[in-house]
């Protein structure tokens, strides 16, 4: 049986043009599903907002490495995938669509609490 058949699929259609302050980030997700137009990083801020970022950008690669390192320091055994558990909020310049598909993304978490930017999200049934 395929695992987690009804897990949500998060897709990014454009990327933030701004470099987000690292201090505002809590976690990230890798988006790799072929049902999405492009591979992407979705940063999750401490305010639980989600921001699509270009995984080819050097700052994005540096940030996700830092988040990986921090995550291993703070909770070495907790790597979890929960695109569903993360709330999207406040519209920004980045579109984010949710569809239903198994294991579309992986979430990597670290710390908690503060301020930030978000994305527009649409639920597709």
């Amino acid at each position: 049986q395929p695992d987690a058949v009804n897990a949500p699929l998060t897709c990014c259609y454009s990327f933030t043009s701004k470099m987000i302050p690292m201090s505002r980030l809590e976690s990230y997700k890798r988006i790799t599903s072929s049902r999405c137009p492009k591979e992407a990083v979705v940063f999750v801020t401490k305010l639980k907002r989600e921001v699509c970022a270009d995984p080819k950008k050097e700052w994005v690669q540096t940030y996700i490495k830092n988040l990986d390192r921090n995550q291993m320091r703070s909770e070495p055994t907790t790597l979890f995938k929960t695109a569903s558990a993360l709330r999207s909020s406040a519209p920004l310049n980045v579109k984010l669509t949710r569809k239903s598909e198994a294991n579309a993304s992986t979430t990597f978490s670290t710390t908690t609490s503060s301020t930030s930017v978000g994305v527009t999200s649409v639920t597709v049934n």
Partner: antibody, heavy 117, light 107 residues
């Protein structure tokens, strides 16, 4: 659906070069990295290098630096890997694969390259 | 370069068995580990990325665990279609490197 289709098998002489192609459909190759991985008969997998088709930037395993060339033609959504100064140890199946994060979720079917005198 | 050591190199098991394959990196790879399944004459198939995240369509009998330098692939109840060779791969830093593979054979 993402599909990577590679060119056919090649038989080459030692010292010569081979160029293998990988045509992508179902994705814009400018949005990903295209990697090349090889597998000698009965052996494990070995990463050769990758290209960012959007700008032509490449990265190689030092073992292949200078002998492997990876290029991409975004107009035809095709990536190429050329290996020069071939020796018998280069006999292998060569795979292209996509992946911006360094792991490979879609693979070509493989191209067998035989180096023999 | 980060070296990946996979063990065992081969194992014999029966349908229904629980199978565990381990992979050890020469340095911390911060969960940036992928597992692949390869059948003879075919390209590898991605099973797991990020040490634990199962790819779409991969049966839930496959699971990944581990952290730091030590990682494990577990098949909870081996099925006939699972007889294959399995590879781990680190994607923490280039050059990306693979383990030597584990061939899972029928007992």
């Amino acid at each position: 659906q993402v599909q990577l289709v590679q060119s056919g098998a090649e038989v080459k002489k030692p010292g010569s070069s081979v160029k293998v192609s990988c045509k992508a459909s179902g994705l814009n190759i400018k949005d990903t990295y295209m990697h090349w991985v090889r597998q000698a008969p009965g052996q494990g997998l070995e990463w050769i290098g990758r290209i960012d088709p959007a700008n032509g930037n490449t990265k190689f395993d030092p073992k292949f630096q200078g002998r492997a060339t990876i290029t991409a033609d975004t107009s035809t959504s095709t990536a190429y890997m050329e290996l020069s100064s071939l020796r018998s140890e280069d006999t292998a199946v060569y795979y292209c694969a996509r992946g911006v994060f360094g792991f490979f979720d879609y693979w070509g079917q493989g191209t067998t390259v035989t180096v023999s005198s | 370069d980060i070296q990946m050591t996979q063990s065992p190199s081969s194992l014999s098991a029966s349908v229904g068995d629980r199978v565990t394959i381990t992979c050890k990196a020469t340095e911390d790879i911060y969960n940036r580990l992928a597992w692949y399944q390869q059948k003879p004459g075919k390209a590898p198939k991605l099973l797991i990325s990020g040490a634990t995240s199962l790819e779409t369509g991969v049966p839930s009998r496959f699971s990944g665990s581990g952290s730091g330098t030590d990682y494990t692939l577990t098949i909870s109840s081996l099925q006939p279609e699972d007889f294959a060779t399995y590879y781990c791969q680190q994607f923490w830093s280039a050059p990306y490197t693979f383990g030597g593979g584990t061939k899972v054979e029928i007992k």
